[in-house]
């Protein structure tokens, strides 16, 4: 037989299919010019010493073969003895290691069999109603195709699926989308309506991430609040790796996951912007405010679930950094200014109440006054901190209030609102004899004592009603009892107590009269 012809003799090897897992597969045959044809195939397994034979059976039942040697591609003309206008059946037999391996057969009409390309170029992937939609430009002059896909996950073999007939300049396919694992897809095409035409090669892998991007395991911690009123947020994360199918390992465009940090400043709700999204690599400095932080994983289908972390406010308080003066027309706060042109956020909330009940006020950008102080004033009508109770006040500052990560804490302190001097007056003052010349004076704690750092001291005043002589005794804010000694029997005294803050003198309690009875000896 001539090498250019299909040889109508028995092939030079025994006729037996070994049924082994290796062997020839994916046989494709098509016309490549007006009178020339090509068949190509893949060979799975060791290639050393393998000889390939392209077998062909005509509709008459006569069969022939082409010897291809070690090649997996073979060309022949319409004069090679193979009928190109009628249906023929083709397959490959590979002779290796004293055994024959056979490919699946293809039955087609060679003249009408056009070489179809797989989807070429960019395959767009999107999500549509819980499924995967792939879309691509139809290869030139190949409108009208049947399309198949195959897909696999890291732990499952290839599964075949059908995209259905296509008849347009763009082709598309709906495929299954996995929730939690990455998939590799490949697509192939063949001529529509051409009986038994060959499938194209499989396309390059299309790597598709899971619908839910993997959520990293993270840990947050914050450093101590620095002198500048800021604290660094630090992150420890578990290295997470998305397991990829074989064809997606290495460079797998499409399966990338991006991690971002979403920061929500809970304190100072009256500021313009409360939320900011940052790249995970750059950990921000935060003020002493309360924050919620979430790590958001996103892939090409959008964000996944996130785990939210709550960072409580730093409650370290400054004892006397804040000065408050109450006048007839309102109240003014003074504190050491941070810098030129700073916006301040003053936040206050009644102590012991839920953080959600905080109120705040934003100042216009202000420069320090001549004494280097910043101020905030409000009228009595505004009702701000007007109730006679303890408030927790925090002042934040920023030169760029629109930038969430540039706020710093100026100070945190406690303040007793309303008419503190009257509200703080101690009640239930009682006098008990202690000895022949002394008494013990007790009183109920002032309301100011509920406000850490506000009550500076108690003052107990004792007045001798005969001589009108007055003595005053300072008492520690933690004490509610004092012993008055050096008193004379039979003399009437009055005692009063007041509670003082660092900037306000308290109102005296109601005078309490007492005397030490004269002891008559037998």
């Amino acid at each position: 037989c001539r090498t250019s012809e299909c040889c109508f003799q028995d092939p030079p090897y025994p006729d037996a299919d070994s049924g082994s897992a290796s062997g020839p597969r994916d046989l494709r045959c098509y016309r490549i010019s007006s009178d020339r044809y090509e068949c190509s195939w893949q060979y799975e397994g060791p290639t050393a010493g393998v000889s390939h034979f392209l077998r062909c059976c005509l509709s008459s039942g006569r069969c022939c073969y082409f010897a291809a040697g070690s090649a997996t591609r073979l060309q022949f003309s319409d004069q090679a003895g193979v009928s190109v206008l009628y249906t023929v059946t083709l397959w490959v037999e590979s002779w290796a290691r004293n055994q024959t391996e056979k490919s699946p057969e293809v039955t087609l009409q060679l003249y009408n069999s056009v070489k179809y390309e797989p989807p070429l170029g960019d395959i767009k992937v999107s999500k549509l109603a819980g499924q995967l939609r792939m879309e691509w430009e139809t290869p030139d002059n190949q409108v009208g195709a049947e399309v198949q896909f195959r897909h696999r996950t890291p732990s499952s073999p290839w599964k075949l699926g059908d995209c259905g007939p296509q008849d347009d300049d763009t082709e598309s396919c709906l495929c299954p989308l996995e929730m939690n694992v990455a998939q590799e897809f490949q697509l192939r095409r063949r001529q529509l309506g051409s009986q038994g035409s060959s499938w194209s090669k499989w396309s390059s892998p299309v790597c598709v991430p899971p619908e839910n991007p993997p959520q990293p395991q993270v840990r947050f911690s914050v450093e101590q609040l620095g002198q500048d009123g800021r604290r660094r947020l630090t992150l420890k994360e578990q290295p997470t790796q998305l397991e990829l199918p074989e064809g997606c390992q290495g460079l797998a465009p499409g399966t990338e996951v991006t991690y971002r940090l979403q920061l929500h400043m809970l304190s100072c709700p009256c500021k313009a912007k409360a939320t900011r999204t940052l790249h995970l690599g750059k950990m921000p400095y935060l003020s002493g405010a309360a924050y919620n932080v979430a790590v958001i994983s996103s892939n090409q289908f959008g964000p996944g679930l996130n785990q939210t972390w709550h960072i409580p406010a730093d409650t370290h308080t400054e004892p006397v950094a804040l000065n408050i003066s109450v006048g007839t027309n309102g109240t003014t706060m003074y504190w050491p200014a941070r810098a030129q042109s700073m916006t301040y956020c003053i936040e206050w909330q009644p102590v012991g109440q839920d953080g959600g009940l905080a109120t705040c006020s934003l100042t216009a950008p202000q420069d320090p006054d001549p004494a280097g102080m910043a101020t905030y004033s409000w009228s009595r009508e505004s009702g701000a901190m007007g109730q006679e109770k303890c408030y927790y006040i925090t002042i934040f500052a920023s030169a760029h209030p629109e930038k969430l990560t540039l706020w710093s804490t100026v100070l945190s302190t406690y303040h007793f609102g309303g008419n503190a001097s009257a509200a703080g007056t101690p009640h239930h003052v009682s006098v008990k004899n202690h000895s022949l010349d002394s008494v013990s004076v007790d009183w109920a704690p002032s309301l100011l004592s509920t406000c850490p750092g506000v009550l500076k001291e108690y003052v107990v005043r004792c007045r001798d009603e005969d001589s009108k002589q007055v003595s005053e005794h300072p008492v520690q804010p933690t004490e509610t009892q004092v012993t008055l000694s050096g008193l004379r029997a039979g003399v009437a005294y009055t005692v009063q107590v007041r509670a003082d803050t660092a900037w306000l003198r308290g109102v005296w309690s109601q005078p309490q009269r007492f005397s030490i009875e004269v002891q008559v000896s037998d």
């Epitope: 395991q217 578990q238 290295p239 785990q307």
Partner: antibody
């Protein structure tokens, strides 16, 4: 020695709150995260949330969001877990557990919380 | 969330025998972030294995862990009377989930 000591058993009515404590000793309190895990009678283990004792930073499992609060007191090296709006399904043994390197290397003995009307 | 399924639910063996407990994850457990715990009645769980195969401090070498991806195994080479308990696997690669447990009982 290194240990986590939990508060005693509690009986609560539906709708009430319970606060369980976990006192740590034998190691630096602020160096290890503490988790809370619960186990209903005859059931498996369910993760509730985590607290960083250093800054009080917390994160809770989705199903407990809004009902659980974890706090700490650095002066006594104690972590607290408060669960509100209790229902009968919350009857369980509540464990605190110390995190080693992401896994739980040390557990408290558990606190039985019974919710019954 | 990652669901862990342990099998068998109950395993009846005699002291001296070999026990093989299985834990299968609904999706791949990142970097073998899998631990095994032992729990005896009325006691807290105790860490046996972390990182799928590393033994915790003080755990006898008859306990060993293996596996990766979605399939993990705890093996007790020669059962001692004190080994009869409930065993839980736990993944800590994405939040935290536990298996439903395998009860190892004396035959």
């Amino acid at each position: 020695q290194v240990q986590l000591v939990q508060s005693g058993a509690e009986v609560k009515k539906p709708g009430a709150s319970v606060k369980v404590s976990c006192k740590t000793s034998g190691y630096t309190f602020t160096s290890y995260y503490i988790h809370w895990v619960r186990q209903a009678p005859g059931q498996g283990l369910e993760w509730m949330g985590i607290i960083n004792p250093s800054g009080g930073i917390t994160s809770y499992a989705q199903q407990f969001q809004g009902r659980v609060t974890m706090t700490r007191d650095t002066s006594t090296s104690t972590v607290y877990m408060e669960l509100s709006s209790l229902r009968s399904e919350d009857t369980a043994v509540y464990y605190c557990a110390r995190e080693g390197d992401w896994y739980f290397d040390l557990w408290g003995r558990g606190t039985l919380v019974t919710v019954s009307s | 969330e990652i669901v862990l399924t342990q099998s068998p639910g109950t395993l009846s063996l005699s002291p001296g025998e070999r026990a093989t407990l299985s834990c299968r994850a609904s999706q791949s457990v990142s970097s073998s972030y899998l631990a095994w715990y032992q729990q005896k009645p009325g006691q807290a769980p105790r860490l046996l294995i972390y990182g799928a195969s590393s033994r915790a401090t003080g755990i006898p070498d008859r306990f060993s862990g293996s596996g990766s991806g979605t399939d993990f195994t705890l093996t007790i080479s020669r059962l001692e009377p004190e080994d009869f308990a409930v065993y839980y696997c736990q993944q800590y690669g994405s939040s935290y989930t536990f298996g439903q447990g395998t009860k190892l009982e004396i035959k």
